[in-house]
Interface confidence: medium
């Protein structure tokens, strides 16, 4: 997956820091105070649809075969720049009973972006 | 994740059968001859962005907090209807040396769709 460098407008991963205070979650998250969540942005022209990233690979490649051949309904189906690989992160937070929980939370950080 | 029923235009899972013969893969895939790959289609209005499906959950919810508050650059970032849960499927195929391989191939079947 591409890293966005400002030079390309093709689907890429953009760095982004999330502050838990900003989104009002500091009432239950103890640590960290925020993290690099990142996000995906950019164009997905038809020739790269289904070719980047990992997790959507087989399925998106199959669908792209139909799309490239103008097969209805895929010809008009827009390919999207989305997370294709996400990583977990460890968090310290309060449960409802104000007990402190330490847990690896799935799908927190975008590692790779690709065209769906 | 919603199943498309023709009544809604909100992001949903649409049934779709892939024929390996149609896409010219029957020269290396022995079985099955095709499968229900399914795909995602539909609108992702801002109020449902990041709210459906499972695998993008934490990350998309976090990003959606910023989007809903008109935070740049997310205000203009289009939310997409994409697979959020994929399922593997067992396949019988030839490898490059014409050996017959039986393997569970990841991410073949779309189980759920959601807004990124």
């Amino acid at each position: 997956g591409l890293e966005c460098d400002g030079k390309v407008n093709i689907c890429c991963k953009k760095q982004f820091f999330v502050s838990f205070k900003d989104i009002g979650w500091n009432d239950w998250i103890i640590a960290p105070s925020g993290y690099h969540a990142n996000y995906c942005e950019g164009e997905c022209p038809s020739h790269i649809a289904g070719t980047s990233g990992s997790s959507l690979s087989f399925h998106s490649t199959v669908i792209n075969h139909y799309r490239m051949r103008g097969h209805s309904p895929f010809a008009n189906l827009k390919s999207c720049c989305v997370p294709t690989k996400l990583r977990p992160m460890s968090m310290l937070y309060y449960d409802d009973g104000q007990n402190i929980i330490k847990k690896d939370i799935q799908n927190m950080i975008v590692e790779e972006c690709g065209c769906s | 994740g919603l199943e498309c029923d023709g009544k809604v235009n909100i992001c949903c899972k649409k049934q779709f059968f892939v024929s390996f013969k149609d896409i010219g893969w029957n020269d290396w895939i022995i079985a099955p001859s095709g499968y229900h790959a399914n795909y995602c289609e539909g609108e992702c209005p801002s109020h449902i962005a990041g709210t459906s499906g499972s695998s993008l959950s934490f990350h998309s919810t976090v990003i959606n907090h910023y989007r809903m508050r008109g935070h740049s650059p997310f205000a203009n970032l289009k939310s997409c209807c994409v697979p959020t849960k994929l399922r593997p499927m067992s396949m019988l195929y030839y490898d490059d040396g014409q050996n017959i391989i039986k393997k569970d191939i990841q991410n073949m079947i779309v189980e759920e769709c959601g807004c990124s």
Epitope: G24, I105 | T51, S57
Partner: antibody, heavy 122, light 112 residues
Framework: QVQLVQSGAEVKKPGSSVKVSCKAS????????WSWVRQAPGQGLEWMGG????????NTAQKFQGRVTITADESTSTAYMELSSLRSEDTAVYYC???????????????WGQGTLVTVSS | DIVMTQSPLSLPVTPGEPASISCRSS???????????LDWYLQKPGQSPQLLIY???NRASGVPDRFSGSGSGTDFTLKISRVEAEDVGVYYC?????????FGGGTKVEIK
């Protein structure tokens, strides 16, 4: 201080629908599990289903499938339960309950709404 | 569905005396992570239920230490070391190992 405030009592005709709301205040909304539990007069507690806004996943007990719709509006921190095709046996107090953050369906319910009495009568 | 069976149905108690309620599940509530997904709730007359014990043996915040939970797998017990007048109500066990979440039929505790 977390508070769950439910909508008021309802009297409904058989065959109609009812939509009960549960507005949360004093905390975050999306990472928690929001369940609906009902209690018929003089009976025990019965889980109907719930929703986890952070993942958008909803779950409904088989008994209510096709009749119950559970939704959540993050912008107003409100969970909703709509029950359709009402019959007299649906006369009960309906409670919303909040399960711990990021605990999925394996949640314990520390906070409960005050309950909403729904009476189904012709 | 997991069936939860409570006993006794009714429990007349004397203030200051101990009390014990049993809860049995139709399948083990012990997860591979080591937790028993069983909670105990008390519903006082005219009130909403309140959490007493979670994950089999952990007392919820603000719950007096006279309440304790024990057991593992399919057999669980809620004990009140010395019953007080304010403890009257219906006690429910609840399993959260798998959906649908299910409750026991309840045990009504009343003062003799």
């Amino acid at each position: 201080q977390v508070q769950l405030v439910q909508s008021g009592a309802e009297v409904k005709k058989p065959g109609s629908s009812v939509k009960v709301s549960c507005k949360a205040s004093g905390g975050s909304f999306s990472p928690y599990t929001w369940s609906w539990v009902r209690q018929a007069p003089g009976q025990g507690l019965e889980w109907m289903g719930g929703i986890i806004p952070i993942s958008g996943t909803a779950n409904t007990a088989q008994k209510f499938q096709g009749r119950v719709t559970i939704t959540a509006d993050e912008s107003t921190s409100t969970a909703y339960m709509e029950l359709s095709s009402l019959r007299s046996e649906d006369t009960a107090v309906y409670y919303c309950a909040r399960g711990g953050p990021l605990s999925g369906w394996r949640a314990s319910y520390y906070y409960w709404g005050q309950g909403t009495l729904v009476t189904v009568s012709s | 569905d997991i069936v939860m069976t409570q006993s006794p149905l009714s429990l007349p108690v004397t203030p200051g005396e101990p009390a014990s309620i049993s809860c049995r599940s139709s399948q083990s509530l012990l997860h591979s992570n080591g937790y028993n997904y069983l909670d105990w709730y008390l519903q006082k007359p005219g009130q909403s239920p309140q959490l007493l014990i979670y994950l089999g043996s952990n007392r919820a915040s603000g719950v007096p230490d006279r309440f304790s939970g024990s057991g593992s797998g399919t057999d669980f017990t809620l004990k009140i070391s010395r019953v007080e007048a304010e403890d009257v109500g219906v006690y429910y066990c609840m399993q959260a190992l798998q959906t649908p979440i299910t409750f026991g039929g309840g045990t009504k505790v009343e003062i003799k």
